[in-house]
Structures are given as C-alpha cells and as structure tokens.
C-alpha cells in the first residue's frame, strides 16, 4: 500500500508511518515501527505538557518567586502548568503574571473606585461634590460631607473634596 | 484469547539467582509494553519492572534496580526477569503482566504467577 | 507500609454502593491522571477494573466507575453482587524513581 501523507487527529508521520502522539502529560521515548507502538512516558516532577504531542522534553513548571511577591495559586500537575498570583497587597504586572506591584493608593481628592485583586490595580475616582477622602488610601471610599443640618448645627467652613465641612453652633443672636 | 504463562520459579538460597519466563500468545506481542508485578504472601502488590514494546527502555523499582534484569525477544514472544543476588524479601509470587496498549503503568491481562522462594 | 492508602476492609449487602476510598499525595494521585483499579479474587491474578481514573476497559461491568479528587481517588461499586466479593488494590504512576505504587488492598465483603 502507498505510505500515508497525512495522518489522523492524535497520530504523526514520521518515516512514511502514522504514529500515536502521547496524550498529555507525557513525553516520546520512541517513534512507532511497523512492529511496535509509540513509547511514552509520563512527565517527571515539576513537569507538564498540556497537549498530544511528540514532544522528547516536558516543560518545567513555571516558578512563583516570593523574591517578585508571586505565590502559588494552583499547582502544576502533569498535564497543566503552575499558576502564579500576588502576594496580598500586590497585583500582577502582566496576564502571564511573572512579577508583582504593589497596589496603587488613591491621593487625597481620589477615593477608591474599585479594590485592586490580584491581577488588577486599585482604580480611583476624583470625589465628586459632596465626597472628600483627606488621606492615602487603597482601600478608601470618599466619604460624604457631615451633615451639619442633622446634628442641629451650621456650617462655618465648607468641604472639599480633600476635606470635611466643619460644623458649628448656630447663632442664637436674633435680629 | 490473551494469554501469559510464567516459569522459572522455584526455590533458591539468599544470594542466589533465578531467571523467569513468560511466554506470551493471543497478541501481537512487540505492539505492548510488559511488566513484571510480585505479591509476597499474604501482601499486597508491587511493581517491579517494565519494559517497552522493543525491549529499548527498560523501567525497575527501587528495591530490585542493580539486581534484577528484564528483557524481551519478540521474535520467540517471551519476557525474562533475570533475578540476582536474590533476598528473602524477593520471596513472592511473580506475574507477568501485559501493559494497556504503549501504558506499561496499566496491567490489562495477568498471567497466573510463579512462586520465587528465597530461604536457606 | 504502603505508598497509597486504602481502607482495610468496607463491606455492603447486595444491591447496595459502596466506596473505597485511595490516598495519595501531591507526588502521585494529586499529580497524574494515572490511577487504576484492580480486583483480585483469593488465588486469582488481579483483573483491571479502571485505568486513568475513570476508564473502564472493555467486558467490564459498568457497576464499576472511578473518580479522583485532589490526592485521593475512588471505586464505587454500585449494585453490589456476590461475586464482587474481593481485594481491591489502587495504583498510580509517581514522580518517585519508584515510578508504579500499589494501595495495600481494600477487602470487600458482601454481606
């Protein structure tokens, strides 16, 4: 019979022969003959490969290095690799999350908009009026004025967006 | 039908050598992996080696690697254990085991075992 | 003492399910989809009953199924019959030198 050009899904050519790939999490030993079968053998420690493949080397997993704030958020097998994330208080640099920042605080003016995870940094907003924030925060809100109104008591000196109004006693002096 | 008959069991001092045989049949032979798996009395099981369907890689357990050889010759369909320096802890019977396709890992058809008895 | 670690004994009457449980670590179960299963009546061969945790070769009875979660895997046995009566043995591949690691074998009685 003619030698195969193509070969099906799972299967390679290799010397006019379809041969097996090895399923995930294994590596090639050796190529099918006519006599014998593809040979594979599972990856070793720290190892992976999450395809069919024919490949002679499985591919280290990857290292969470505490020294860039990464830690271990799932652990490689033979078939998947390890996924990285932040330690608490950083964020990833990139998708691939090979190092970490420290999240971005909101200056005074700016409350936080959304609290930073581990992939993603603090977003801010400016505090609109009404809403002051007078510190450095990553995890503050703006706050609302106080309401001098409810406490019986008079505004002496209007907020901003850095600071609170402050209230005073009414003026019992009448006219 | 798949079939594996093991010989070459038998009793033998500590120190001493045996080799095994398991003739296999019902299979194109050089198409699977094939292992050798032993249960001492009483015990549960314990791998022991493997081989690929060509006979090239060779795999063994830690408490049989330096003295325990296996070889194939798919031309006569046989799998060997060339057993040496044999311990009474060898004591076992010993199956021979066909791997699931390339799997050696996998054991889908056993033979009926062969007692290896190391005593003096 | 066994690499895996499987009950000692479980029983059940028939009709019932049952479960044996296979421990592992990180090194083996936790690390390979490569866990078997095996029945081995008194003076028989073992049988393979599952392989990659889930798989049952052919002739075996689908009563028979497999599972793993994190380092432990498990056969459950479902409708249980009197011929199901047993050892049990577990295995996986390891990232050891040792490479194939056996449980200590689960008996099972039907009651």
């Known amino acids: 019979p003619e030698p195969p050009t193509a070969c099906r899904e799972k299967q390679y050519l290799i010397n006019s022969q379809c041969c097996s790939l090895c399923q995930p999490g294994q590596k090639l030993v050796s190529d099918c003959t006519e006599f014998t079968e593809t040979e594979c053998l599972p990856c070793g420690e720290s190892e992976f490969l999450d395809t069919w493949n024919r490949e002679t080397h499985c591919h280290q997993h990857k290292y969470c290095d505490p020294n860039l704030g990464l830690r271990v958020q799932q652990k490689g097998t033979s078939e998947t690799d390890t996924i990285c994330t932040c330690e608490e208080g950083w964020h990833c640099t990139s998708e691939a999350c090979e190092s970490c920042v420290l999240h971005r605080s909101c200056s005074p003016g700016f409350g936080v908009k959304q609290i930073a995870t581990g992939v993603s940094d603090t977003i801010c907003e400016p505090c609109p009026v009404g809403f002051f924030s007078n510190v450095s925060s990553a995890f503050e809100k703006c706050h609302p004025w106080t309401s001098c109104e409810t406490k019986d008591l008079v505004v002496q000196q209007a907020g901003t967006n850095k600071t609170d109004v402050v209230c005073g006693p009414q003026d019992r002096l009448r006219a | 039908e798949v079939q594996l008959l093991e010989s070459g069991g038998g009793l033998v001092q500590p120190g001493g050598s045996l080799r095994l045989s398991c003739a296999a049949s019902g299979f194109t032979f050089s198409r699977n992996a094939m292992s050798w798996v032993r249960q001492a009395p009483g015990k549960g099981l314990e791998w022991v080696s493997a081989?690929?369907?060509?006979?090239?890689?060779?795999y063994y357990a830690d408490s049989v690697k330096g003295r325990f050889t296996i070889s194939r010759d798919n031309s006569k369909n046989t799998l060997y254990l060339q057993m040496n320096s044999l311990r009474a802890e060898d004591t076992a019977v010993y199956y021979c085991?066909?791997?699931?396709?390339?799997?050696?890992?996998?054991?889908?058809?056993w033979g009926q075992g062969t007692l290896v008895t190391v005593s003096s | 003492q066994s690499a895996l670690t499987q009950p000692a004994s479980v029983s059940g009457s028939p009709g019932q399910s049952i479960t044996i449980s296979c421990t592992g670590t990180?090194?083996?179960?936790?690390?390979?989809?490569?866990v078997s299963w095996y029945q081995q009546h008194p003076g028989k061969a073992p049988k393979l009953m599952i392989f990659e945790v889930n798989q049952r070769p052919s002739g075996v009875s689908n009563r028979f199924s497999g599972s793993k979660s994190g380092t432990t895997a498990s056969l459950t046995i479902s409708g249980l019959q009197a011929a199901d009566e047993a050892d049990y043995f577990c295995?996986?591949?390891?990232?050891?030198?040792?490479?194939?690691?056996f449980g200590g074998g689960t008996k099972l009685t039907v009651l």
């Open positions: 081989t690929g369907g060509s006979g090239i890689s060779t």
């Open positions: 990180s090194s083996d179960v936790g690390n390979y989809n490569l």
């Open positions: 085991a066909r791997g699931y396709s390339n799997s050696w890992w996998y054991f889908d058809y």
């Open positions: 295995s996986s591949y390891t990232t050891s030198s040792t490479y194939v690691i």
